[in-house]
């Protein structure tokens, strides 16, 4: 059985939708799947890898590093999206192509940046982890790290930067998928918001989905235990 | 307000090594992004980079004149040094020190410039 | 390194008169940036990343181009722009500026 839920919930673009969640029902009345998981089911994909949720993660990783940073035109926010998804009158897309990115590094005029730009995170403003020297920030954004430290600037005068975040990972589902979503929408969903990054692939859905110890490697389910737990 | 102001030894004889000083105020060299660079003027002609130093002490010198030149700091002191060894009188000019940042630009300018100290190089 | 080509070397204007200098560079660049320096005193940034205008720069100061060709417009000269104008590079090292262009007031 399912219980549907449906709700008006701030979305990505600044406006209440109505949202369906879908739920299915414990045919024994108790805890949902999600809890079962939790609790140490034998659910596969947190045992081994599975197939399927490896190439979700990996179509998702793709389609992130061609994204970049939607801002509302009225300063409303700013999301991190496709350019298909982001309006070409109502905001400005973002995104470092042919020689307009940046330099990898103040170092090494030579290389320009082509993945990016990120919505609130920028080589150049993070203090911590700082891109430099030995630690440059590959030019491939599904492959930077969280950034912990912003500069101590209130504005940079970057465009990405100085907007107002709408958006941030959102772990969805006993896939493990990941979506950039408002806080709202996240939490209707029943789903894990990561205030702390910027996007998904820095974020492992499965290993909060699984829950119990986390993974020794965020990438491999290893919860072999489970196989004696249920 | 940010100021910047250069000093040095006015004259100096060729081959002797020149020190130059960067005072600077309203900003700190510890501030993460920030750098001071040095720029020259013969006078009546163009300007010149010479070196720049940023707050994580990453260096920049102009390799043509990479071998004689030293850049350095004292972040507590708000001071940037300049040394230039072996001079000559193709060192004669105006030397300007300028606060270096990259806000809202995908690169770095130069946003604020000393008023400029001379040096002239004769025997 | 990249040579930055002003050109013309010397103008002059009359008050009101639109006025257009260029900045050819020997290889394609990303962006440039313009300092106006008055006699006695040191360069003011007026424009970086091509096109956008330095705190308290006047509008009708604008830079535009791409690749290895770039220019400064004044739309309306003021006796107060008599000045010499230098385009610079920081696409790659050595930095370099151009050899300025000088702007009088006729």
């Known amino acids: 059985a399912q219980h549907v839920t449906t709700q008006l919930v701030l979305r990505n673009k600044g406006v209440y939708e109505s949202v369906k969640y879908i739920q299915q029902e414990n045919f024994w009345i108790g805890p949902s799947s999600i809890d079962l998981i939790h609790l140490g089911a034998k659910f596969s994909p947190c045992i081994r890898k599975d197939q399927q949720i490896e190439q979700l993660v990996l179509r998702e990783r793709d389609l992130e590093r061609d994204s970049g940073c939607c801002v509302q035109n009225d300063h409303s926010g700013c999301i991190q999206t496709q350019r298909k998804d982001c309006s070409e009158t109502l905001a400005t897309f973002v995104k470092w192509q042919d020689d307009t990115g940046p330099p990898m590094d103040k170092s090494d005029l030579g290389q320009k940046r082509t993945s990016g730009a990120v919505c609130h995170q920028d080589p150049r403003t993070c203090e911590e982890p700082a891109s430099s020297g030995a630690h440059i920030w590959p030019d491939d954004i599904t492959k930077w790290p969280i950034c912990t430290e912003q500069a101590k600037s209130n504005r940079t005068g970057f465009l990405h930067m100085d907007c107002q975040i709408k958006g941030r990972p959102c772990c969805i589902s006993t896939k493990g998928s990941c979506e950039i979503t408002t806080r709202e929408y996240c939490e209707f969903m029943h789903g894990y918001f990561h205030e702390e990054a910027t996007l998904c692939s820095q974020v492992h859905c499965l290993d909060k989905v699984c829950g119990l110890l986390p993974f020794l490697n965020p990438e491999v389910p290893d919860q072999f235990y489970r196989l004696w737990l249920s | 307000q940010v100021t910047l102001k250069e000093s040095g030894p006015g004259i100096l004889q060729p081959s002797q090594t020149l020190s130059l000083t960067c005072s600077f105020s309203?900003?700190?060299?510890?501030?993460?992004?920030?750098?001071v660079g040095w720029i020259r003027q013969p006078s009546g002609k163009g300007l010149e980079c010479l070196a720049h130093i940023w707050w994580d002490d990453d260096k920049y010198s102009n390799p043509a004149l990479k071998s004689r030149l030293t850049i350095s700091k004292d972040t507590s002191k708000n001071q940037v040094f300049l040394k230039i060894a072996n001079v000559d009188s193709a060192d004669t000019a105006t030397y300007f020190c300028?606060?270096?940042?990259?806000?809202?630009?995908?690169?770095?300018?130069?946003?604020?410039w000393g008023t400029g100290t001379t040096v002239t190089v004769s025997s | 390194q990249i040579v930055l080509t002003q050109s013309p070397a010397l103008m002059s204007a009359s008050p009101g008169e639109k006025v257009t200098m260029t900045c050819s560079a020997s290889s394609s660049i990303s962006y440039m940036y313009w300092y106006q320096q008055k006699p006695g005193s040191s360069p003011r940034l007026l424009i970086y990343d091509t096109s956008n205008l330095a705190s308290g720069v006047p509008v009708r100061f604008s830079g535009s181009g791409s690749g290895t060709s770039f220019s400064l417009t004044v739309s309306r000269m003021e006796a107060e722009d008599a000045a010499t104008y230098y385009c610079q590079q920081w696409n790659s090292y050595p930095l370099t500026f151009g050899a300025g262009t000088k702007l009088e007031l006729k």
């Open positions: 300028a606060r270096i940042l990259n806000y809202g630009s995908n690169y770095w300018y130069f946003d604020v």
């Open positions: 309203g900003f700190s060299l510890s501030t993460f992004g920030l750098g």
